[in-house]
Interface confidence: low
């Protein structure tokens, strides 16, 4: 799903207040709901009729440092006999997410939000058939 | 996928530097890759064999203000005849994501990261049959 553009409102102070100095804002330390966790069914990536693999990208100057990307294993979907059925399609499910980028020059450390596109998994769909004239 | 705990390292300055004052950090305005966007197949939520609906939560003090959650429509999966097959299961695919929470008291505005659990879509899986002793 899409993250809207920031525009110039969310991170601004009310109009009656002095502007934010130096184009930066105050980010409080700590993460709300940090202990909240994913509770997905086990091994769905291999049990799915549109199975996928995971790859992990690592960047120590990003939070979270690990971002996991899914790749659909097949073009078609897996039928009850365990065979690929190419009359159906495995398609990726994508999500826009925010990460935090750390930038430092010596002792001056600042952070910036970054939008990252994550493929979370795959689903099996009926293909759209185009009749070409 | 899971976002790790922040611990006490990512948002800290190097040990040789003076500590961050007042438990807050400098967040630069603007979002890197803001124009990056999801390019998913059209209407996959209704074409999927594990179809889902979307609901939107809205919070003006969160960025993004809109968070979209998916809910699987069925317990089973939709077969080639368009009927629900309860020998298979529709299961949610979840993703931990970050949002920014805005907190203000008068002209003092600060921001804090918040972890949100988003159900992005659903996939069709072979159920795990447990023979409970």
């Amino acid at each position: 799903r899409k993250i809207p553009k920031v525009g110039h409102t969310f991170f601004q102070k009310p109009e009656s207040c002095p502007p934010v100095p130096g184009g930066s804002m105050k980010l409080d330390i700590g993460i709300i709901n940090e202990n909240q966790r994913v509770s997905m069914s086990r091994n769905i990536e291999s049990r799915s009729t549109s199975p996928w693999n995971y790859t992990v990208t690592w960047d120590p100057n990003r939070y979270p440092s690990e971002v996991v990307q899914a790749q659909c294993r097949n073009l078609g979907c897996i039928n009850a006999q365990g065979k690929e059925d190419i009359s159906m399609n495995s398609v990726p499910i994508q999500q826009e997410t925010l990460v935090v980028r750390r930038k430092h020059q010596g002792c001056s450390v600042s952070f910036q939000l970054e939008k990252v596109l994550v493929t979370v998994g795959c689903t099996c769909v009926t293909p759209v058939i185009h009749h070409v004239q | 996928r899971k976002i790790p705990k922040v611990g006490h390292t990512f948002f800290q300055k190097p040990e040789s530097c003076p500590p961050v004052p007042g438990g807050s950090m400098k967040l630069d305005i603007g979002i890197i890759n803001e124009n990056q966007r999801v390019s998913m197949s059209r209407n996959i939520e209704s074409r999927s064999t594990s179809p889902w609906n979307y609901t939107v939560t809205w919070d003006p003090n969160r960025y993004p203000s809109e968070v979209v959650q998916a809910q699987c429509r069925n317990l089973g999966c939709i077969n080639a005849q368009g009927k629900e097959d309860i020998s298979m299961n529709s299961v949610p695919i979840q993703q931990e994501t970050l949002v920014v929470r805005r907190k203000h008291q008068g002209c003092s505005v600060s921001f804090q990261l918040e972890k949100v659990l988003v159900t992005v879509g659903c996939t069709c899986v072979t159920p795990v049959i447990h023979h409970v002793q």
Partner: nanobody, 125 residues
Framework: EVQLVESGGRLVQAGGSLRLPCAAS????????MGWFRQAPGKEREFVAA????????AYADFVRGRFTISRDDARNTVYLHMTSLKPEDTAVYYC??????????????????WGQGTQVTVSS
């Protein structure tokens, strides 16, 4: 967040019956498969029964099958454990739990994200 509150636990004689309700509040109750677990003194928590989101599908541990029935009333946001032919070995604290996903692995304790505080059932001989 989902809050779960069990009730109905008490002292009952062997061969007797009990009905344990578990009332849910918070996020939409119908979004969750629900389960009952129990923990006897000095033992690990164990799976008793579970019911799917739709209420059409239920699973039971072998030691309660035929004696216990799980049901749900979505209008009342309540799941019930109906217990009959109770035995002294059924003595335990009974916990209600909700899952945030469904895949047929009813008895896997780690799949249950939300838990009640428990209600004590004591079966005397």
């Amino acid at each position: 967040e989902v809050q779960l509150v069990e009730s109905g636990g008490r002292l009952v004689q062997a061969g007797g019956s009990l009905r344990l309700p578990c009332a849910a509040s918070g996020r939409t109750f119908t979004s969750y498969p629900m389960g009952w677990f129990r923990q006897a003194p000095g033992k690990e928590r164990e799976f008793v029964a579970a019911i799917s989101m739709s209420g059409d599908d239920a699973a039971y541990a072998d030691f309660v099958r035929g004696r216990f029935t799980i049901s749900r009333d979505d209008a009342r946001n309540t799941v019930y454990l109906h217990m009959t032919s109770l035995k002294p070995e059924d003595t335990a604290v009974y916990y209600c739990a909700a899952r945030t996903s469904y895949d047929g692995t009813y008895d896997y304790i780690d799949d249950y994200s939300y838990w009640g505080q428990g209600t004590q059932v004591t079966v005397s001989s």
